[in-house]
């Protein structure tokens, strides 16, 4: 008795039904629960980075649900009283607990599907999430660590004479910053209460061959660089330009 | 076998603290609700506390709530009752409980033997 | 004084069929299921019924229950010696916002 196991080889999936907003899941489908049903008893909890503004669908151990007695999804958010939503087979009774908000729901009806979901994933989402099922063989559990990814926002200037700064904006979690070619560097972290973090980099280059530099943004939601020239005019800036 | 062990029972004074351990075994604790029942001696049950399988979620009964907090280790597979303020109609066999209806649609399948706590001066 | 009312007290032969009302009220067993436990003398309590109606592994069938509005009844047929002991109804009530015990009733086989 404990966590099912998912599939090793299973990969984000991009959901085709929602074309507003992509969508990402970590479930098997009917097929996969079958062939996985013997890993039922092996230990999980899935540290899931889920991009901001997506939907996400977070899902039950594959169980099949005519051997369920009751799901519950236990919900912990930074700072707020845990919400549980609970599932009732026999009865066909739902219930929950401290839930407020109406982002986080079942996919469909529980009967037919376990499955939570996500509407518009919002920092405020980071958090535990698990889901526990309750069936004659014992309790099963699956266990999401979400960590909400926000995109920082890039910019690259020459502040004064042979420096630029490169800048990641409200990233989270924080961006890493690296130069082509190197200079003299000096990196800045600024955290913000809702959790992002803004970082700074700023460097020098004595080398004046050096004519253009190259700021590369290294993040989980992708990658960008950005390249400026540098202009030897004291207090000259110049706008950088996006690969 | 699912096991359930309670310890930390004994005699204190009254206003006196105690605080209750059960230790569990034989199944994942994690994925349980868990309560403490009382009895007092030669009379009934009396349901004390109840704590979701991540401790997020607490119930107590009026009687003791303000004195009593409930607390679980998922790491140490341990359930506890811290109890203060205590009094002399504390006294009971304290037990431990399981609850697979996770709070939600409570009953309690599996129980411990129990610990008794005397308050008397 | 127990939010659900059972007998105090309950009796019959070997082989007899007895039963055990346990009454309470619609924030309790009118809404929210009935669980009945078994307590041998100086042991810990016992799940006998569960969801009003369902018995666990190795519970043997002469014990069965059900319940009706606010009252719950545990049958037992082909009453046993073993039987003797007290038994208990509880339901979560959503009124105390906590789970309620009868006061018990002490079972005698004759």
């Known amino acids: 008795e404990g966590a099912a196991q998912p599939n090793n080889s299973l990969m984000l999936q991009t959901s085709k039904e929602n074309h507003a907003l992509a969508s990402s899941s970590l479930c098997m489908d009917e097929k996969q629960i079958t062939q996985n049903y013997s890993k039922v008893l092996a230990e999980v909890n899935t540290s899931w980075p889920v991009k901001m503004a997506t939907n996400a669908v977070l899902c039950c151990p594959p169980i099949a649900l005519r051997n369920l007695i009751i799901i519950t999804w236990e919900i912990i958010l930074r700072g707020q009283p845990s919400c549980t939503k609970a599932y009732k087979k026999e009865t066909n009774e739902t219930k929950e607990t401290n839930c407020t908000d109406e982002r986080i729901t079942w996919v469909s009806r529980p009967d037919q599907n376990s499955d939570l979901q996500i509407r518009t994933v919002a920092i405020t989402h980071d958090g535990y999430y698990r889901c526990i099922m309750v069936t004659p063989d014992g309790n099963f559990h699956r266990g999401y660590h979400l960590q909400v990814l926000v995109t920082p926002e890039v910019t690259l200037f020459q502040n004064r004479n042979r420096t630029a700064v490169c800048k990641a904006v409200a990233g989270k979690p924080a961006a890493h910053i690296s130069w082509i070619p190197e200079g003299d560097c000096a990196t800045k972290q600024e955290y913000w209460s809702n959790g992002t973090v803004t970082v700074k980099s700023t460097c020098h280059w004595e080398v004046h061959n050096v004519s253009t530099v190259t700021c590369h943004v290294s993040h989980l939601t992708g990658n960008k660089s950005l390249y400026i020239e540098l202009l030897p005019v004291p207090g000259a800036k110049k706008s950088a330009k996006l690969y | 076998e699912v096991q359930l062990l309670e310890s930390g029972g004994g005699l204190v004074q009254p206003g006196g603290s105690l605080r209750l351990s059960c230790a569990a075994s034989?199944?994942?604790?994690?994925?349980?609700?868990m309560s403490w029942v009382r009895q007092a001696p030669g009379k009934g049950l009396e349901w004390v506390s109840s704590?979701?399988?991540?401790?997020?979620?607490?119930y107590y009964a009026d009687s003791v709530k303000g004195r009593f907090t409930i607390s679980r280790d998922n790491s140490k597979n341990t359930l506890y009752l811290q109890m203060n303020s205590l009094r002399a109609e504390d006294t009971a066999v304290y037990y431990c409980?399981?609850?697979?209806?996770?709070?939600?649609?409570?009953?309690?399948?599996?129980w411990g033997q129990g610990t008794l706590v005397t308050v008397s001066s | 004084q127990s939010v659900l009312t059972q007998p105090p007290s309950a009796s019959g032969t070997p082989g007899q069929r007895v039963t055990i009302s346990c009454t309470g009220s619609?924030?309790?067993?009118?809404?929210?299921?009935v669980s009945w436990y078994q307590q041998l003398p100086g042991t810990a309590p016992k799940l006998l019924i569960y969801?009003?109606?369902h018995r666990p592994s190795g519970v043997p069938d002469r014990f069965s229950g059900s319940k009706s509005g606010t009252s719950a009844s545990l049958a037992i047929s082909g009453l046993r010696s073993e039987d003797e002991a007290d038994y208990y109804c509880g339901s979560w009530d959503a009124s105390l916002n906590g789970y309620v015990f009868g006061g018990g009733t002490k079972l005698t086989v004759l």
């Open positions: 969801d009003d109606s």
């Open positions: 704590i979701s399988p991540g401790g997020g979620s607490i």
């Open positions: 409980a399981r609850d697979p209806g996770q709070m939600f649609w409570p009953l309690f399948d599996y």
């Open positions: 034989g199944f994942t604790f994690s994925n349980y609700a």
């Open positions: 619609s924030s309790n067993i009118g809404s929210n299921n």
